[in-house]
Amino acid sequence: PEPPTACREKQYLINSQCCSLCQPGQKLVSDCTEFTETECLPCGESEFLDTWNRETHCHQHKYCDPNLGLRVQQKGTSETDTICTCEEGWHCTSEACESCVLHRSCSPGFGVKQIATGVSDTICEPCPVGFFSNVSSAFEKCHPWTSCETKDLVVQQAGTNKTDVVCGPQDRLRA
């Protein structure tokens, strides 16, 4: 018969034949042959593989480093990675939760809508027209642009969401 060019789901093509993939939680020891099945072995302690695979090495479970404020939220299994979370009152810096911060800052152009608490991180909002923030902050709101008119000045440079307006003297040449 013709050698296959594609294999079924949960199989892989090697040496012109279809071999079974190893199930999650197991790694590949040897490919199948015409006479033998694929040989797989369970991942060791603190290792995992989360898909049907032909990997020869299992992945190490994530380490929740207490020096970074991390603790184990869910212990890993042979089929799943460990899930880390932050100590109480701290917040993950990303979905993967690789490190912790007390709270995040709002970047220039954004103001603080709500200051962080033990359970919720800082909530930022974009500075609307007429307001700006030129700093990274965990407490400062957007500031209103300076009103040049109230100082008997004119706008020399328009404000943005990150910069205040620049005021200057009135043009004295006008009648």
């Epitope: 490190s99 912790c100 995040r104 800052s105 700093v135 965990a138 400062e140």
Partner: nanobody, 116 residues
């Protein structure tokens, strides 16, 4: 290496005052927003007060407004918290924190005990 060293805590009677200091090293202190945070025994972290990098803006939690004053001396790389009219509920370990507020920048804190 960034280091924040808090000091000035101690035992004080209700109604008394204390001034906490936070000596910063390993980074350019000027221009960084700074916070005071506290943790009472068996409780979570509470954000007490903050000061902008320029020193021009401050924040106080409602629980300390009118009693505590945050300040900074950029020439001494030091953050301060003046605490007046202290109450039993102010008993906590007080920490200072700098942006980006990473756990590994966390100091040891200084213990404030308000008791008669």
């Amino acid at each position: 290496e960034v280091q924040l060293l808090e000091s000035g805590g101690g035992l004080v009677q209700p109604g008394g005052s204390l001034r906490l200091s936070c000596a910063a090293s390993g980074f350019t202190f000027a221009g960084y927003e700074m916070w005071w945070v506290r943790q009472a025994p068996g409780k979570g972290l509470e954000r007490v007060s903050a000061i902008s990098g320029s020193g021009g803006s401050t924040y106080y939690a409602d629980s300390v407004k009118g009693r505590f004053t945050i300040s900074r001396d950029d020439s001494k790389n030091t953050l301060y918290l003046q605490m007046n009219s202290l109450r039993a509920e102010d008993t906590a370990v007080y920490y200072c924190a700098k942006e980006p507020y990473s756990y590994d920048y966390w100091g040891q804190g200084t213990l404030v005990t308000v008791s008669s």
